[in-house]
Interface confidence: low
């Protein structure tokens, strides 16, 4: 399971699902924190190791996932053509 942790924000505020957040995940053995359907999730550690990011199903329902060159991240493409790029540091 994962919970969203807000960075630099008053803890009394509702947890905002915004860019300036990280996820704290309690994952089973062989899993690691990742992204599924644009939400933090526990994913197979092999996906992270091999950088096959799209295998996490990181994009929203109905979007297309593509690996960035050199597997530095992925893009999610909406049916309308707009693209959101995520890079992994």
């Amino acid at each position: 399971t994962c919970e969203i942790v807000t960075l630099d924000r008053d803890s009394s505020q509702p947890r905002r699902t915004i860019a300036r957040q990280t996820a704290r995940c309690a994952c089973r053995k062989g899993q690691i924190a990742g992204t599924t359907r644009a939400r933090p999730a526990c994913v197979d550690a092999r996906i992270i190791k091999t950088k096959q990011w799209c295998d996490m199903l990181p994009c929203l329902e109905g979007e297309g996932c593509d690996l960035l060159i050199n597997r530095s991240g992925w893009t999610c493409t909406q049916p309308g053509g707009r693209i959101k790029t995520t890079t992994v540091s």
Partner: antibody, heavy 121, light 112 residues
């Protein structure tokens, strides 16, 4: 050309449920997030709610219980559960672009022309 | 609940002037703002999304700026056809209660 058209607007008496429909041409509704927005005569725009490809929904706090958004394979529908005179407005359906949630901006890139609902005794 | 305070409610400008419309969000919305133009009897049309991105087909005299909770739509060198009502739309998503979108009250722009 990508277009939306709303239908179902008419004169109803208070308390009579009314369902509006939104159909698309040039793209498939099923792959998109869709929203309903309304505008009372001479007033501003009010966001009612959103429906996701999965069929799950979110509503403005004032709209919860007053409206139900649903979808079929070809339409996105808005049910006004118990109309009052305050619900007299033009109702627009709009396609959601951007990304809903998790730090993504959300906006409407295609709007229908609207359908007028009049609630009167 | 997110509140978008839009100012001014109305303004009058001459052709060629620069017009600025401001929207102040009740909290940081991290560039989750878009701007729309609406003419009488017509649906709104998208001008700017993500605070500063110009929608395709929109004249470059329209621009958006801002960050945090404070955003501005600028029309540089306003034209007669820009007479309309302009709305901002702010959006946030809460992990507990989902997506919430709120429009500003609108700004009616009259061209002298």
């Amino acid at each position: 050309q990508e277009q939306l058209v709303e239908s179902g607007g008419r004169l109803v008496t208070p308390g009579t449920p009314l369902t509006l429909s939104c159909t698309a041409s040039g793209f498939f509704l099923s792959g998109y997030y869709m929203s309903w927005v309304r505008q009372a005569p001479g007033k501003g725009l009010e966001w009612i709610g959103i429906i996701y490809p999965s069929g799950s929904t979110d509503y403005a706090s004032w709209a919860k219980g007053r409206f139900t958004i649903s979808k079929t394979s070809t339409t996105v529908d808005l049910k006004i559960t118990t109309p009052t005179t305050e619900d007299t407005a033009t109702y627009f359906c709009a396609r959601v672009a951007g990304y809903v949630g998790y730090g993504y901006e959300t906006f409407f890139d295609i709007w229908g022309p609207g359908t007028l609902v009049t609630v009167s005794l | 609940e997110l509140v978008m305070t839009q100012t001014p409610p109305s303004l009058s400008a001459s052709v060629g002037e620069t017009v600025r419309i401001r929207c102040l969000a009740s909290e940081d919305i991290y560039s989750g703002i878009s701007w729309y133009q609406q003419k009488p009897g017509k649906p709104p049309t998208l001008l700017i999304y993500g605070a500063s991105n110009l929608e395709s087909g929109v004249p470059p005299r329209f621009s958006g700026s801002g960050s945090g909770s404070d955003y501005t739509l600028t029309i540089g060198g306003v034209q007669a056809e820009d007479a309309a009502t302009y709305y901002c739309l702010g959006g946030v998503t809460y992990s507990s209660t989902g997506t919430h979108l709120t429009f500003g009250a609108g700004t009616n722009v009259e061209i002298k």
